[in-house]
């Protein structure tokens, strides 16, 4: 490769000058050898235009020179009064044109804007505001002030001090004339449109004594911010449009193939069905800024997104916007997990939630997506144990299996539980994921009594029937509290073959509390799991009452009542908000469900796994 180096491309406009600097290794020979600038012709020959030995070609005469700077190993080719004819392929080099010590340079000269002398350039984003300053002399202070827009060879009046306003600028332009002594008037244009782009002329007075000032207004479309997110992950668009539109409806839209923008969500309650269950528009701050969170990213979510403000809740020309180009990386770090989990009425679901494995200490949350208005997601459970009171006894968040996944178990399912739920943490917000729970036809696999009344001081057995398909699973009973579900000590009774030859309709694992104490009152779960992966659960409420009759009480499935009356507790709603996502301590205060007492422990509680025949009852 050649040791000579320079710019591979140079772009400029007609009438301008360029200074092309070429670098060479500053050896003694190189410093003193001939330097040249030549143009490559169709034949491949390179015709010298200017050289360090004083040669200048005829079409470069008076407008080009080459200066060598041997001390730092550079030479500079200056070319003035560029024309479009100068566009082409050149070489800067050392020695003889045909030898290899050269570097290829492409020069592109385009038609430039011809701005009158003294033109002030204003560069403003679309939808924003510009203030054009127009100076004038004292003798023109009492005279008419005006702003014109130059269109071709004509000038169109935009606004003047006699209250004329061009219809194209109606309701978004004003001319301000300051008090005496200040020899400048200003024109303020709000909600700039791309069509406002162009050359303007300020004028004060008329005739030969008038004051004029040119202004070049460049209205830019916002450069889209590039956003790269992982498949199945989450993206947050933070939109700050300024105080001027703080009280105007906000929206996020996606640019389609027709270059129009389809509303994804807005503050007027509109939402694209493709984002159902996985989008939130977080309430705006006082400054009018807001954010939109989209979870469960799909490849088809890629595209150009705009946020903006307009009373119609959709894109309108001349209103401020912000832009993003979203790329969804299919080589995702976020593991696949079911996006739909199915359960039956009365049954349960166990949802696996991914989180960034580097953030094992982060707080974990689960919330219920609600689609009303802008969408919201009240928290139901968190790893520190706070649970919405109406979920008492039937919802738990477990740190297992760990290493990037936690588990949420919800049982006593009803059709009202169908919907979208979000898994999130107070750490990496890109790992928020969405799961849909669907309630389908069917019967729960685990059968427990509806509710149980135990007698103080006596023994209580609670049966849990499971089908043969769970024979290889680990069975457990646990006592639910608002900080989790504490597994009760298991007591192995009898040989394990009880579950091997599973030819009966059902098998049984039973919980024994002996003797029953006040602290035993509460919710108990029977469940199955494989290692750290949880399967179905069933819940039973145990009420404890004073002794009335002597003896032991065994609750058989035949005596199982309907599900216990649910406690209806007032609960403050906790929502995912902009700040709260980062710091869940910022959520609104709410009642905490009181812990349901000591965990049953020691020899008082035992789990007995045996066949139903041995328990003296069966469940069909």
């Amino acid at each position: 490769k050649s040791p000579v180096f320079g710019p591979q491309e140079v772009s400029s406009v007609e009438g301008n000058s360029v200074s092309i600097k070429c670098y060479y290794p500053p050896t003694s020979v190189n410093r003193h050898t001939r330097k040249y600038w030549c143009r490559k012709g169709a034949s491949g020959r390179c015709i010298t235009l200017v050289s360090s030995e004083g040669y200048v070609s005829s079409n470069y005469a008076g407008r080009a020179n080459l200066t060598n700077f041997p001390e730092n190993g550079t030479f500079v080719v200056n070319i003035a009064q560029l024309s479009r004819d100068d566009s082409g392929h050149y070489k800067c080099g050392l020695g003889i044109n045909s030898r290899g010590l050269s570097f290829d340079v492409s020069l592109e000269v385009s038609q430039g804007p011809e701005l009158p002398n003294g033109t002030e350039v204003y560069t403003v984003d679309v939808g924003r505001t510009v203030t054009i300053k127009c100076p004038f002399k004292t003798e023109n202070a009492p005279k008419t002030k005006a702003l014109y827009k130059k269109i071709g060879q004509t000038s169109v009046l935009v606004i003047d001090s006699r209250n004329y306003v061009n219809p194209n600028y109606k309701d978004r332009i004003r001319l301000r004339i300051p008090g005496t002594g200040q020899l400048i008037f200003t024109v303020v244009i709000d909600r700039l449109r791309l069509s406002d782009h162009g050359l303007y002329l300020c004028q004060a007075g008329d005739g030969s004594n008038r004051d004029e000032k040119n202004a070049d207004l460049q209205v830019l479309e916002p450069e889209p911010e590039l956003v790269y997110e992982d498949l199945r992950g989450s993206v947050t668009f933070h939109c700050a449009l300024g105080l001027e539109v703080a009280n105007v409806a906000k929206f996020l839209c996606r640019v389609n193939s027709r270059e129009t923008c389809d509303v994804v969500i807005n503050t007027l309650g509109k939402r694209d069905s493709a984002f159902e269950g996985r989008i939130l528009l977080n309430p705006q701050d006082k400054d009018g800024s807001f954010s939109v969170v989209i979870t469960g990213l799909r490849k088809e979510d890629e595209g150009r997104y705009l946020c903006g403000a307009h009373s119609d809740g959709q894109l309108q020309e001349g209103w401020p916007i912000q832009a993003w180009q979203l790329f969804v990386n299919e080589e995702s770090t976020i593991p696949r997990s079911p996006t739909v989990v199915k359960g039956v009425a009365g049954g349960s679901v166990a949802v696996l939630c991914p989180y960034n494995p580097k953030e094992s200490q982060s707080l974990k949350y689960w919330c219920l997506w609600e689609g009303a208005q802008n969408g919201r997601c009240p928290l139901l459970v968190e790893s520190q144990g706070l649970v919405q009171e109406q979920y008492e006894g039937r919802l738990s968040l477990l740190q297992e299996p760990g290493n990037g996944t936690f588990t949420v178990i919800l049982n006593q399912l009803t059709t009202q539980d169908a919907g979208f739920y979000w898994c999130l943490t107070n750490g990496d917000t890109r790992w928020r994921t969405t799961v849909e729970i669907k309630i389908i036809e069917g019967e729960p696999n685990l059968k427990v009594p509806g509710n149980v009344t135990a007698v103080l001081g006596e023994t209580l057995n609670i049966p849990c029937h499971f089908p043969c398909k769970f024979s290889s699973y680990e069975k457990y009973w646990c006592k639910w509290s608002n900080t989790g579900c504490q597994t009760l000590p298991s007591q192995d009774e009898g040989p394990s073959e009880a579950f091997v030859n599973c030819d009966e309709n059902s098998r049984l694992v039973s919980l024994t509390l002996n003797p029953v104490t006040r602290a035993d009152e509460g919710w108990y779960w029977c469940g199955v799991k494989q290692g750290h992966f949880y399967g179905e659960t069933a819940a039973v409420y145990v009420a404890v009452e004073e002794k009335k009759v002597a003896g032991s009480r065994y609750v058989s499935p035949a005596k199982a009542d309907a599900a216990p009356d649910e406690k209806v507790l007032d609960s403050g709603v906790r929502e995912i908000e902009n700040k709260a996502i980062q710091d869940p301590r910022l959520f609104a205060e709410e009642k905490v469900v009181a812990d349901t007492g000591d965990q049953a422990g020691g020899s008082r509680a035992s789990v007995d796994s045996s066949s139903s025949e041995e328990q003296g009852g069966s469940s069909k």
């Epitope: 710019p7 301008n16 000058s17 360029v18 670098y23």
Partner: nanobody, 128 residues
Framework: EVQLVESGGGLVQAGGSLRLSCAAS????????VGWFRQAPGKEREFVAH???????????YYGDFVKGRFTISRGTAKNTVYLQMNSLKPEDTAVYYC??????????????????WGQGTLVTVSS
């Protein structure tokens, strides 16, 4: 104080494309020049591309030898953003990519010594 922030790195398959962004905060690029460099594990920082613009609509584009037309450096209309569009990526393009800006006039744009402000880098991984 100027802060440069790169973004757009990631994992891409050989033959794929990425667009890196370099955004300046604290002030606009009053130096009118920005360079991209890259550093592969165990190797020296290597010049990738450089853009220099004059206020009079003139722009100069410089590229490293290995680029061979695959990369394009450009400036955003916002004027405080510079992009590096990388096409036909190869596994040997795997590196941390840095953007840099000088305080004033620059000598040789290929030299890291010419630059005063550096970003924290963005990792580009090209798998075969």
């Amino acid at each position: 104080e100027v802060q440069l922030v790169e973004s757009g790195g990631g994992l891409v398959q050989a033959g794929g494309s990425l667009r890196l962004s370099c955004a300046a905060s604290g002030r606009t690029f009053s130096s009118d020049a920005v360079g991209w460099f890259r550093q592969a594990p165990g190797k020296e920082r290597e010049f990738v591309a450089h853009i220099h613009w004059s206020g009079d609509f003139t722009t100069y584009y410089y590229y490293g030898d290995f680029v061979k037309g695959r990369f394009t450096i450009s400036r955003g209309t916002a004027k405080n953003t510079v992009y590096l569009q990388m096409n036909s990526l190869k596994p040997e393009d795997t590196a941390v990519y840095y953007c840099a800006a000088p305080k004033g006039a620059i000598g040789d744009p290929r030299s890291t010594r010419e630059y005063d402000y550096w970003g924290q880098g963005t990792l580009v991984t090209v798998s075969s």
